[in-house]
Interface confidence: medium
């Protein structure tokens, strides 16, 4: 009986439906390979329900297994550009707390101008995810070409 | 108490588990870049539980945040074909109602013969999703090479 | 009332939250194109909640529609390596029971060194999923470059 009532009274966030989809805000200064993200209905189709942004990086608010996905498209790019500037690599990882720092997802562009992937991974409340783009090419800020998101899947 | 009883009595669709996975039916006539999809157990491993097809395009029946995913493989393709016929681009977007028209996901083939990606996006009842393949190359109709689907994630 | 009580008493697995994320263990002997997977918290960020491993292949324990995803990166690879060793192809399929054998997802590497994709597909208890890598190139065992997983989505 208690569970049924709880379901009726609690907001969606307490049912574990944490989810976020972010769009690129800007790249970091020269020695900082991180991409800086933004989200919210005023910005288009990006949103944060549960997770939060901390200086452009995504911070998790609920323990659980998450589906993490990303697509990054390089801005002024052809297959010859991409191969000439190789290696250009995108890595998604936990960057803080430092004790949990790990790379979760890594892809190189080789002769392509877009990478896209997804994976399931356990994340804990307080984990901050960083997306590092190494190389000299710049990412597109078009919201249908570059995006990053997480979806809570189960405890 | 009411919630528990509702859960027992309502079909899955009313719990918000809308989901669809489609296979390619055919390409459009020459000036129509849209791919036309089909789904249903008689056709193999494709299905529609909630969303519907409207003249080969996917129409959403329930408001919510969806995971949209797609893979398209070109039919006669090598890396040289792909680069010679560049740009070949795949875009997934809301094409109707016109007031909500927007591109959600866009990828170019460059020197590759397959694109695959996914993203989270809010969709509303009545939104119709179109998948536009621009360029002169044709998609494979093999069901393990070309497919398109959506999964309701949360309200 | 019964549903609410059941929810309180049953473990997560009985709510249908089957999920697995695997890392590469090893490749098969010369005539066996299958990749052999492993999972478990002792191995890093891989896990099995519901599905099981049977001689390195993933066996499903619950009927339903699943999101299947994979990323495979070739180990010592550049775009010239990839094109010189073409065709290198990755296929994910049901390999047993033999009566249900079918290819679910197929990608070629062409001039790239990583493939990544995902799809929704119905799977039944007892289905075993195999991932076949054909060609002469070897996959990377880095856990952020090569992984394979499934997530139960709905009945």
């Amino acid at each position: 009986q208690r569970f049924a009532q709880a379901q009726q009274q609690l907001p969606l966030e307490s049912l574990g439906w944490d989810v976020a989809e972010l769009q690129l805000n800007h790249t970091g200064p020269q020695q900082d390979p991180r991409l800086y993200w933004q989200g919210g209905p005023a910005l288009g189709r990006s949103f944060l329900h549960g997770p939060e942004l901390d200086k452009g990086q995504l911070r998790i608010h609920r323990d659980g297994i998450y589906m993490v996905h990303i697509q990054v498209t390089l801005a002024i790019c052809s297959s010859t550009t991409a191969s000439r500037h190789h290696p250009t690599t995108l890595a998604v990882g936990i960057c803080s707390p430092a004790s949990r720092s790990i790379s979760l997802l890594r892809l190189s562009f080789h002769q392509g101008c877009t990478i896209a992937s997804q994976r399931l991974t356990p994340l804990a409340r307080g984990d901050t995810l960083c997306t590092n783009l190494t190389g000299t090419l710049l990412p597109s800020r078009n919201t249908d070409e570059t995006f990053f998101g997480v979806q809570w899947v189960r405890p | 108490q009411r919630f528990a009883q509702a859960q027992q009595q309502l079909p899955l669709e009313s719990l918000g588990w809308d989901v669809a996975e489609l296979q390619l039916n055919h390409t459009g006539p020459q000036q129509d870049p849209r791919l036309y999809w089909q789904g249903g157990p008689a056709l193999g491993r494709s299905f529609l539980h909630g969303p519907e097809l409207d003249k080969g395009q996917l129409r959403i029946h329930r408001d919510g945040i969806y995971m949209v995913h797609i893979q398209v493989t070109l039919a006669i393709c090598s890396s040289t074909t792909a680069s010679r016929h560049h740009p070949t681009t795949l875009a997934v977007g809301i094409c109707s109602p016109a007031s909500r028209s927007i591109s959600l996901l866009r990828l170019s083939f460059h020197q590759g013969c397959t694109i695959a990606s996914q993203r989270l996006t809010p969709l509303a009842r009545g939104d119709t999703l179109c998948t536009n393949l621009t360029g002169t190359l044709l998609p494979s109709r093999n069901t393990d090479e070309t497919f398109f689907g959506v999964q309701w994630v949360r309200p | 009332q019964r549903f609410a009580q059941a929810q309180q008493q049953l473990p997560l697995e009985s709510l249908g939250w089957d999920v697995a994320e695997l890392q590469l263990n090893h490749t098969g002997p010369q005539q066996d194109p299958r990749l052999y997977w492993q999972g478990g918290p002792a191995l890093g960020r891989s896990f099995l909640h519901g599905p099981e491993l049977d001689k390195g292949q993933l066996r499903i324990h619950r009927d339903g529609i699943y999101m299947v995803h994979i990323q495979v990166t070739l180990a010592i690879c550049s775009s010239t390596t990839a094109s010189r060793h073409h065709p290198t192809t990755l296929a994910v399929g049901i390999c047993s029971p033999a009566s249900r054998s079918i290819s679910l997802l197929r990608l070629s590497f062409h001039q790239g060194c990583t493939i990544a994709s995902q799809r929704l597909t119905p799977l039944a208890r007892g289905d075993t999923l195999c991932t076949n890598l054909t060609g002469t190139l070897l996959p990377s065992r880095n856990t952020d470059e090569t992984f394979f997983g499934v997530q139960w989505v709905r009945p």
């Epitope: - | 039916n25 055919h26 390409t27 020459q30 069901t143 | -």
Partner: nanobody, 119 residues
Framework: EVQLVESGGGMVQAGGSLRLSCAAS????????MGWYRQAPGKQRELVAL???????NYADSVEGRFTISRDNAKNTMYLQMNSLKPEDTAVYYC?????????????WGQGTRVTVSS
């Protein structure tokens, strides 16, 4: 059921031309992808040309600019015009149709016609 019957194969000198035909019967002709595969001795079957119901075409790199695929929906026939033939074009050429039937996807193949190009 779809039946596909090829004709037009034969022997030809390098640099010469041949025109293959594929007559289809048994289903509406205009809505499926059709194409030509070939298989050379000891090699895998490869798709060399593809055409849609409304005439969009694609070619393998090895034949682009030399081969032309076309179809005549009124006659339920597809063609492959092969010019500037090379010895490496020697193969058995198969007509192919890809159609959705009520019970799922069907792929149909002809019995093949042999093309031999001598140098």
């Amino acid at each position: 059921e779809v039946q596909l019957v090829e004709s037009g194969g034969g022997m030809v000198q390098a640099g010469g031309s041949l025109r293959l035909s594929c007559a289809a019967s048994g289903k509406p002709f205009s809505f499926y992808f059709m194409g030509w595969y070939r298989q050379a001795p000891g090699k895998q079957r490869e798709l060399v040309a593809l055409i849609t119901g409304d005439g969009m075409t694609n070619y393998a790199d090895s034949v682009e600019g030399r081969f032309t695929i076309s179809r005549d929906n009124a006659k339920n026939t597809m063609y492959l015009q092969m010019n500037s033939l090379k010895p490496e074009d020697t193969a058995v050429y198969y007509c192919y149709a890809d159609v959705w039937a009520g019970a799922g996807r069907d792929e149909y193949w002809g019995q093949g016609t042999r093309v031999t190009v001598s140098s």
